[in-house]
Amino acid sequence: LVPHLGDREKRDSVCPQGKYIHPQNNSICCTKCHKGTYLYNDCPGPGQDTDCRECESGSFTASENHLRHCLSCSKCRKEMGQVEISSCTVDRDTVCGCRKNQYRHYWSENLFQCFNCSLCLNGTVHLSCQEKQNTVCTCHAGFFLRENECVSCSNCKKSLECTKLCLPQIENVKGTEDSGTT
């Protein structure tokens, strides 16, 4: 099956790589604009230059193109704890990330929030914190894992999900008491 091509892709595929078909004259192939620039005017004829202009401050194009306008630079979302890793340039969008010892949780494909990496207090680090994944902790005896933090089994009440995790310790305590009374 031939993949469905949009009008722009169909037009571009008629011309060699790095060129696009003139919107008013499909016999002319114009050279695309370099990254960091945008299309101001189509080439007037075959072999003639396309009029490309550099993107203005606050905008960019990251690849060769024939866009009539540059793309607006992204802004890092402070309310999501994001920080700017690198500023926007004419040929590269802003790069946003999290602070040291934080990881990203993606709410959607392009929107992430920064959260602090777990320190594994009362436990050991099983897997270190990564860009998109919190630390994985293994808890010491007498502690259970709750939202990736090690919490004392003394905080575990009956009928909660921690009972299974704390059961071995409870049994050990009972066993010690039982052996002491015989």
Partner: nanobody, 120 residues
Framework: EVQLLESGGGLVQPGGSLRLSCAAS????????MGWVRQAPGKGLEWVTA????????FYADSVKGRFTISRDNSKNTLYLQMNSLRAEDAAVYYC?????????????RGQGTLVTVSS
């Protein structure tokens, strides 16, 4: 066994309001981030809003900011979603969900959902 039971959906006119509730059981509700996920007809799941266990931290999708408010009552193991100024594009099945932090977008454990229809 984790159970999440949504209620409060229905038919509302554009500009109207609805309040959704989610009764949670089978886990320690106050320990977890909880939220609302929606799925419009023919579209994928999307996070609408979420709230931390203590209620001190929240997330809202840009499309609902200023119109929707998430809240929780840990003493009642209940999550709420107040939806105001409803629009046609808000029509969807709304699911209560347990948030699994890290990576994503993932949609955690969800309830059966409640249908919200916005139509005049």
């Amino acid at each position: 066994e984790v159970q999440l039971l949504e209620s409060g959906g229905g038919l509302v006119q554009p500009g109207g309001s609805l309040r959704l509730s989610c009764a949670a059981s089978g886990f320690t509700f106050e320990w977890y981030w909880m939220g609302w996920v929606r799925q419009a007809p023919g579209k994928g799941l999307e996070w609408v809003t979420a709230i931390s266990g203590s209620g001190g931290s929240t997330f809202y999708a840009d499309s609902v900011k200023g119109r929707f408010t998430i809240s929780r009552d840990n003493s009642k193991n209940t999550l709420y979603l107040q939806m105001n100024s409803l629009r046609a594009e808000d029509a969807a099945v709304y699911y209560c969900a347990k948030v699994k932090l890290g990576g994503g977008p993932n949609f955690g454990y969800r309830g059966q959902g409640t249908l919200v229809t916005v139509s005049s």
